[in-house]
């Protein structure tokens, strides 16, 4: 059987000879060299060599336990002649003994940590960790103790855990933000002769809201022209806050003053400035100076710092309204006038009024914008703003005239205003009614008396207030002895009726009927229209079959016997 125990070897051997490990020996070995000892496994033939005759093992190189603490090898004892093993192949261990040859090494060369300013003493900041590659199971070579080399009295470190805590009350970021702390880790439980390593911890105090906003001045003055439209920025005010980030965010508001309704303040999120803007239209002539009380406050407040006072500040803002030479202002935004279409030239329609709103009350002259009245139908009295016609009107041509009137300051022609004028032309009965279309109809030869052969419609260009009322009749010259009659339907239509039984197209092929159409307005207007009636052969259903191609026309425009 094999005769050995576990082999132990001290690491980092510095002798000049190979380091002796131990002896492999089989009780079958007679000492005559008949056995051959063979080593295999971790480092065999390289780190570890064996005397194949004696079984003595030596280490050829300096070994480092931290690199490899245990080597597992296999031993064979073989009969040199036959190759026959005299023992079963066996595994054995070479264990490397530790020496304190490694200093503690921090997991980071530099740690960065943050802790809120004004933290209570003992507030956790960060935990640093150092590891020692030496054997933790043997001696104190890997027992690490932490201490602080730099960073007192602000911070402390727990010797066992490496936890860094705050050690000073009321550390103020606004006073000092950055701290560099140096921590030492020492092995051998911190005893003399222990190896040590250090790390740097860069600690930043993070901001808390422990400072209110402050205006650098108590009063601000801005000027703005009275013409500034709503939304116009007038000026910027800025309160400073020693804090940073959201703790330094400021909201501005107007809390008091006679300009409370006239101005707004908005917060510029980028610059943290308050922008004073116009809220309503200003009028120098009404009020020349406004005062506002503007407040700057932190939107996020930490209750534990309220004892330091309110987290807001206020300032007075004085706004001076500057006079602006303003254009004339019309009494209305638009004017609507009306005039009869039969008005004579120079008839006055109405008038416009404009005034200079400035204190100077400069006189104004009026004119028509000729781009809006190319035909020069209207004119204006430049002095008093009276509008009058300069040409005759026709409602039936144009119902509405849309023109623009200009008011200009006489002393400063650059200051002018414009106003729209809508002129409605009122109707006058100046058009006669007419047939709605050209009427040409036919009558069957075998037609019976009082038979309706055509319905007549009329149109009138006028637009009477109470609507059209037309009357129809045969012209006086055709009324007696006519072959047809006109029946007025009293609904603005009329019918042509036969007056006899039967017509002979060979005797009279065409009749021309003069019809008088009158309206019922003042003054009455009438016109005469002619209806052509052809005599045709029809079937028994009354459908036309044939007519003469042309009518015999009487020189007076009436057929004989119509």
């Amino acid at each position: 059987s094999w005769m050995w125990n576990q082999f132990f070897l001290l690491e980092e051997y510095t002798g000049s000879d190979y380091q002796y490990v131990g002896k492999l020996h089989s009780d079958q070995d007679r000492g005559d060299g008949s056995l051959k000892y063979i080593l295999s496994g971790d480092g065999a033939g390289d780190l570890f060599i064996i005397n194949e005759n004696t079984g003595d093992i030596q280490a050829t190189k300096r070994l480092d336990r931290e690199e490899k603490p245990v080597y597992i090898l296999r031993a064979q004892a073989i009969n040199r002649r036959t190759g026959r093993p005299v023992e079963p192949e066996s595994e054995f261990i070479i264990k490397i003994h530790d020496i304190n040859d490694n200093e503690p090494i921090f997991t980071k060369e530099v740690y960065t940590a943050t802790v809120p300013e004004m933290s209570d003493v003992g507030t956790f900041v960060v935990q640093v960790t150092a590891t020692d590659a030496d054997d933790p199971t043997y001696g104190n070579s890997a027992k690490v103790v932490y201490s602080i080399l730099q960073g007192q009295p602000y911070f402390s470190v727990e010797s066992e855990t490496g936890i860094i805590k705050t050690a000073l009350l009321n550390m103020d970021r606004e006073n000092r933000e950055q701290y560099q702390v140096v921590i030492q880790a020492k092995d051998m439980g911190g005893q003399m002769g222990g190896l040590s390593g250090t790390t740097t911890v860069n600690i930043t105090l993070t901001d808390v809201n422990d400072n209110p906003p402050r205006f650098p001045q108590s009063t601000y003055q801005f000027k703005t022209p009275e013409s500034s439209p709503p939304g116009t920025p007038i000026g910027r005010i800025k309160a400073s806050d020693a804090d940073v980030g959201e703790n330094a965010e400021i909201e501005y508001s107007i809390t008091d003053g006679e300009g409370l309704d006239m101005f707004d303040v908005i917060t510029d999120q980028e610059t943290q400035e308050g922008i004073i803007t116009v809220k309503k239209l200003l009028d120098f002539e009404k009020k020349k100076v406004y005062t506002l009380k503007v407040e700057a406050s932190n939107p996020y407040v930490e209750p534990r710092f309220l004892y330091l006072g309110p987290f807001k500040d206020s300032a007075t803002v004085r706004i001076v309204v500057e006079d602006v030479d303003e254009p004339p202002v019309f009494s209305k935004l638009a004017y609507i006038l009306q005039i009869r279409e039969d008005a004579q030239i120079n008839t006055t329609i109405g008038s416009v009024t404009a005034q200079d709103p400035d204190a100077a009350r400069n006189p104004v002259k009026y004119s028509v914008d000729r781009h809006t009245d190319m035909d020069r139908i209207f004119n204006i009295d430049s002095g008093n703003g009276s509008i009058f016609t300069s040409k005759l009107l026709d409602r039936e041509t144009l119902l509405w005239h849309n023109i623009t009137v200009i008011a200009t300051e006489i002393n400063n022609p650059k200051q002018s205003s414009r106003v729209p004028l809508y002129i409605k032309v009122l109707d006058v009965n100046d058009n006669a009614p007419e047939f709605a279309e050209f009427y040409e109809t036919f009558v069957c030869e075998k037609a019976k008396a009082d038979q309706l052969i055509q319905t007549l419609h009329a149109v009138d260009k006028d637009d009477p207030y109470s609507g059209h009322q037309f009357s129809f009749s045969l012209a006086p010259e055709a009324a007696s002895g006519s072959n047809f009659t006109i029946q007025d339907n009293k609904d603005n239509t009329a019918g042509i009726l036969t007056r006899k039984n039967g017509y002979n197209r060979h005797e009279m092929s065409t009749y021309l009927l003069p019809v008088v159409i009158s309206d019922n307005d003042y003054p009455v207007q009438s016109s005469t229209g002619t209806v052509t009636v052809r005599v045709c052969a029809c079937d028994h259903h009354g459908n036309m079959q044939s007519c003469h191609a042309e009518a015999l026309i009487h020189p007076t425009g009436l057929s004989t016997g119509a």
């Epitope: 051959k36 036959t82 190759g83």
Partner: antibody, heavy 117, light 111 residues
């Protein structure tokens, strides 16, 4: 390089003896056993015996125990195999071979011994 | 004596094909996980050459198409892809017990 050089061919009469030499070079002669193997014409290999050069310890196969003698001369790193009472069936090629853990890792070129009347 | 029986006596294999030679010992030649069985190649007019030792270990300088396996009494020599230069007689040998004995040999030829 390891070399085993054997003596030349021999023609012998039946009943006589033959001594074949094997000169070793390229390694420590006393660290390895030396074996002798023969091969009759057209036949297989037959192990005859071996010797430990450091102690002159020998092993012979039963078949040749009374007729074979294996010796060494450590000074010349030479091994010898002497076979006596030769018979026609001893006609063969005789090889020396270095032994290492039961295997023959180097062989001589062989010596032909012919036994004929 | 331990008798070594090789099979087959001869073997014809195409170039590039696998050749397998078996060797059976009359009793076990294994002890403590070591198999005292070795394989040799002999070409005409030349001494034998060691190919495989201790059943499966390839001798230095031998192509890796040769491999050995087995334990106790049954062992195999395999040529994974036969080459022209592999034409030879192959012998197995045991060193487990005196006298050391060889198999009768297997002649490998090209088909």
């Amino acid at each position: 390089e390891v070399q085993l050089v054997q003596s030349g061919a021999e023609v012998k009469k039946p009943g006589s003896s033959v001594k074949v030499s094997c000169k070793a070079s390229g390694y420590t002669f006393t660290n390895y056993w030396m074996h002798w193997v023969r091969q009759a014409p057209g036949q297989g290999l037959e192990w005859m015996g071996d010797i430990d050069p450091s102690h002159s310890e020998t092993h012979y196969t039963q078949k040749f125990k009374d007729r074979v003698t294996i010796t060494v001369d450590k000074s010349t790193s030479t091994a010898y195999m002497e076979l006596s009472s030769l018979r026609s069936e001893d006609t063969a090629v005789y090889y020396c071979a270095r032994g290492d853990l039961g295997r023959f890792d180097y062989w001589g070129q062989g010596t032909t011994v012919t036994v004929s009347s | 004596d331990i008798v070594m029986t090789q099979s087959p006596d001869s073997l014809a294999v195409s170039l590039g094909e696998r050749a397998t030679i078996n060797c059976r010992a009359s009793e076990s030649v294994s002890i403590h996980g070591t198999h005292l069985m070795h394989w040799y190649q002999q070409k005409p007019g030349q001494p034998p050459k060691l190919l495989i030792y201790a059943a499966s270990n390839l001798e230095s300088g031998v192509p890796d198409r040769f491999s050995g396996s087995g334990s106790e009494t049954d062992f195999t020599l395999t040529i994974s892809s036969l080459q022209a230069e592999d034409v030879a007689v192959y012998y197995c040998q045991q060193s487990f017990e005196d006298p050391w004995t060889f198999g009768g040999g297997t002649k490998v030829e090209i088909k």
